[in-house]
């Protein structure tokens, strides 16, 4: 029950996270004009990954796409790539995790297969979240380094005086959406990986024993060895009990003093 809940919650959290990553990638407000020194401005500039926008005092907003690839900085291209990779991985992860959900029955799918799919989707969500966080962080770093760089001239109009104003850009809403969304996707992925451990088939004890008859008075001690799934420690059919019961490897060994009465 706890495993199903963890898996389901992980799926929902990742779903919200990936939706957030998509939203952040599409948003125009990755960088916004810093209004610290000029809170009442007639023009408000902001940029996204795909277009640059201007909101004018009358309420009119104009956005222009970046119709060039070569004219854009490599960092911006890298951010675009990271966000797209994050979305693609997240989308594949969601698709895989739907089939991996314990509450959904698809044919006669083994629990081990569901466990593997859960782990796969979990890893995909983790990488997707990391891509989004990395992309947003790279953009944020680019903003910080360019904070004082971008300048523009503005005429005040009265008497035609020229006033040089620095158009500085600060963090936009999309950055915060991206960070939160990336974090949620990451958390969802971790939850899926945790759920995977619970979904894996548990170790089963079999009372199977191999022994040889060495006389009519064999002191037989029932024992056994574990048939392991690989998750346990007894993976090499080690002898569990001493006595007449032997592991497969010991069948042709020399008789011990305990074999005869």
């Amino acid at each position: 029950m706890a495993v199903t809940a963890c898996q389901g919650l992980g799926f929902v959290v990742s779903l919200i996270g990936i939706a957030g990553i998509i939203a952040a990638t599409c948003m125009d407000q990755w960088s916004t004009q810093d209004l610290y020194n000029n809170p009442v401005t007639a023009v408000f500039n902001y940029q996204g990954l795909w277009r640059s926008c201007v909101r004018e005092s009358s309420g009119f907003t104009e956005c222009r796409g970046y119709f060039t690839l070569l004219g854009l900085p490599a960092m911006l291209q890298a951010v675009r790539a990271l966000m797209i990779v994050g979305i693609v991985l997240g989308a594949i992860g969601l698709l895989v995790s739907i089939f991996a959900l314990k509450c959904i029955r698809i044919g006669s799918m083994e629990d081990s297969a569901k466990a593997n799919m859960t782990l796969t989707s979990g890893i995909m969500f983790i990488v997707s979240g990391l891509c989004a966080i990395a992309g947003v962080s790279v953009f944020a770093n680019m903003l910080v380094t360019n904070f004082w760089m971008s300048t523009a001239n503005m005429y005040t109009g009265m008497g035609g005086m020229v006033q040089t104003v620095q158009t500085r850009y600060t963090f936009g809403a999309a950055l915060f959406v991206g960070w939160v969304a990336g974090g949620l996707t990451l958390i969802g992925g971790v939850m899926m990986c945790i759920a995977c451990r619970g979904l894996a088939p548990e170790e089963t004890n079999y009372k199977a024993v191999s022994y040889h008859a060495s006389g009519h008075s064999v002191a037989y001690k029932p024992g056994g060895f574990k048939a392991s799934t690989g998750f346990g420690s007894n993976t090499k059919n080690k002898k569990i009990y001493d006595g007449g019961a032997r592991t497969e490897d010991e069948v042709q060994s020399y008789p011990s003093k305990h074999d005869y009465v």
């Epitope: 007639a42 500039n45 201007v54 004219g71 001239n153 850009y169």
Partner: nanobody
């Protein structure tokens, strides 16, 4: 440096016509909005007409049907055709433009004002 150069202001009789022009020099990358504002003596500056890059034109209620704002496609130039002028249209007319400063992705748009041209309508 971008500058707005206005022309066409004059003294005109009531009921007459006048054409104001505003040209943005200094080869700006493109306009977001361009238009005209006016300031009558002792009054606040008000919007007369505004043209957006999407082609929408807005007019003040007091000038609707009398004034027409047009743009030259080849240049960042706007013309305000003023017909049936009234004495209350007397004011200093200022050209205002929001222009993009370049094609670079970080290029900001800024607001620019002209120095103003006087329009006097006598009764």
């Amino acid at each position: 440096q971008v500058q707005l150069v206005e022309s066409g202001g004059d003294l005109v009789q009531a009921g007459g016509s006048l054409r104001l022009s505003c040209a943005a020099s200094g080869s700006p990358f493109g306009f977001v909005v361009m238009g005209w504002h006016r300031q009558a003596p002792g009054k606040q500056r008000e919007l007369v007409a505004m043209l957006t890059s999407s082609g929408t034109t807005n007019y003040a209620d007091s000038v609707k049907g009398r004034f027409t704002l047009s743009r030259e496609n080849t240049k960042n130039t706007v013309h305000l055709q003023m017909n049936k002028l009234k004495p209350e249209d007397t004011a200093v007319y200022y050209c205002r433009a929001v222009l993009r400063s370049g094609s670079d992705w970080r290029a900001a748009a800024n607001e620019y004002w002209g120095q103003g041209t006087h329009v006097t309508v006598s009764s």
